[in-house]
């Protein structure tokens, strides 16, 4: 098809070589086609204009994306040729950064239902550049965490080094939907809820004497529980003595509850105290037996093939630790009578 009638948009993606980041292109079909086609229509059925230039299908996947090869070859279907580019509804997701993503991307509806629809297409000229060292060293991350229940903010990575006063007007999207109220380089969230999680896109315009570009960055926002302020607690064993039968095998379980930590390196181990000596026991690997948003319950067992008289003089100690501190629980074995 002839792409000369497509509306054109220029975008710039400046990626950091230090971090993994994604990028998106929206199929910004000219209004009102886009609103009808990509389910962004804010009109009620009674308010639909008499004539829509593009009467597209309501199936959101019915947008076709192409890349225009720089050598003038025919357009290539994105889905067939580029495994690192994912189409989701009207959005194209680039999973990996790199200058090889530079090029012209065209989107248009698959179903052409009227003569008006032929020109219903958008050509996006994407330029991809690595961030230079001269750029801001402390730019905001493309992965940002918001602490549930507290105040937080989402910063536009490409503008995070500028003060609010000197920052240009920013257009924000969340999961592909325009956040019309937000215009600054930072979104302030008064109280963080689960629904604040998602893919945020920030755009601003950069112009030179010749042309203007939309500078775009993508931020993956995650809502998280705050790191625990508590050391782990041992749920089992509860008692410090355990009745056993001599000569019989024995398994003692240590179960500990660890609170949420972003960087999670739990320690759970068994050691034996015998008079002045103390040594760690080689036991089966620890296992998580319950995992919730707030805590992880981890179990580690000590296995004795048969209980001996010597074991009755020893103390079996379970030691658990997180970044806050440690807890121990010791068990003394006692021979069962009768």
């Amino acid at each position: 098809f002839n792409i000369s009638g497509c509306s054109t948009k220029k975008l710039l993606w400046t990626y950091s070589t230090r971090s993994e980041e994604e990028f998106v292109l929206f199929c910004d079909l000219p209004e009102p086609q886009k609103s009808h086609f990509c389910h962004r229509n804010r009109l009620s059925p009674k308010q639909v204009p008499e004539h829509l230039p593009f009467m597209g299908s309501n199936d959101l996947s019915d947008v076709q994306w192409y890349q225009q090869p720089s050598n003038g070859d025919p357009l290539e279907d994105i889905r067939k040729s580029y495994p690192h580019i994912i189409q989701d509804k009207c959005t194209l997701h680039f999973l990996t950064p790199g200058v090889n993503n530079s090029g012209s991307y065209i989107c248009r509806p698959k179903m052409i239902k009227s003569p008006y629809d032929v020109a219903c297409c958008v050509k996006m000229i994407l330029e991809v550049k690595p961030q230079t060292n001269a750029s801001c060293e402390y730019s905001a991350s493309h992965k940002q965490d918001l602490l549930l229940g507290s105040t937080g903010s989402i910063s536009c990575p490409s503008l995070s080094c500028q003060s609010d006063a000197q920052s240009p007007a920013v257009t924000w999207y969340k999961n592909g939907k325009l956040l019309s109220v937000e215009r600054s380089n930072r979104i302030v969230v008064d109280e963080v809820y689960d629904y604040h999680q998602g893919t945020y896109v920030c755009d601003y315009t950069q112009s030179d004497t010749v042309s203007s570009w939309t500078v775009r960055a993508v931020v993956q926002v995650r809502t998280i529980v705050g790191d625990t302020k508590l050391k782990p607690d041992i749920l089992d064993p509860v008692e410090d003595t355990l009745e056993v039968e001599l000569g019989k095998p024995l398994t003692i379980s240590c179960k500990a509850r660890f609170g949420f930590e972003r960087v999670f390196n739990p320690v759970i181990k068994w050691y034996i105290k015998d008079s002045d000596l103390e040594w760690e026991v080689s036991v089966p690997e620890a296992k998580s037996i319950k995992s919730t948003l707030k805590d992880e319950i981890i179990e580690r067992n000590i296995i004795l093939e048969k209980v001996t008289q010597r074991d009755l003089r020893r103390k079996f100690v379970c030691f658990v630790q997180n970044s806050i501190g440690n807890t121990t629980q010791s068990v003394q074995l006692k021979e069962k009578r009768g």
Epitope: P266, E285, K287, S288, S291, L293, E296
Partner: nanobody, 117 residues
Framework: EVQLVESGGGLVQPGGSLRLSCAAS????????MGWFRQAPGKERERVAS????????TYADSVKGRFTISQDNSKNTLYLQMNSLRPEDTAVYYC??????????WGQGTLVTVSS
């Protein structure tokens, strides 16, 4: 640092087999669940299979039942996905993931599986 590294992807003909491996390092315990996910071009990421480390029980997506098998070798800290009777629609990037604090939070970088004649 906790890390998952997938391997074993590649180009295979329809009806062929592949075995994916995921090497886990940095974990001080065995997560409650481990899983394999995939993301095909133009589609969202989907869970293919998962395994419970406590019970050893497994769950599979309907599209792979009877063809794929998930297993783990805790002594080698490795998760596997045996894929048989592969179809063109199985073409995707396959990711290994570990469950932590109520969600699959730790992810590998992925390995590409292409099923084509």
């Amino acid at each position: 640092e906790v890390q998952l590294v997938e391997s074993g992807g590649g180009l295979v003909q329809p009806g062929g087999s592949l075995r994916l491996s995921c090497a886990a390092s940095g974990f001080t315990y065995i997560p409650a669940y481990m899983g394999w996910f995939r993301q095909a071009p133009g589609k969202e990421r989907e869970r293919v299979a998962s395994i419970s480390s406590t019970e050893g029980s497994t769950t599979y997506a309907d599209s792979v039942k009877g063809r794929f098998t998930i297993s783990q070798d805790n002594s080698k800290n490795t998760l596997y996905l045996q894929m048989n009777s592969l179809r063109p629609e199985d073409t995707a990037v396959y990711y290994c993931a570990a469950y932590q604090f109520g969600a699959f939070r730790v992810w590998g970088q992925g390995t590409l599986v292409t099923v084509s004649s």
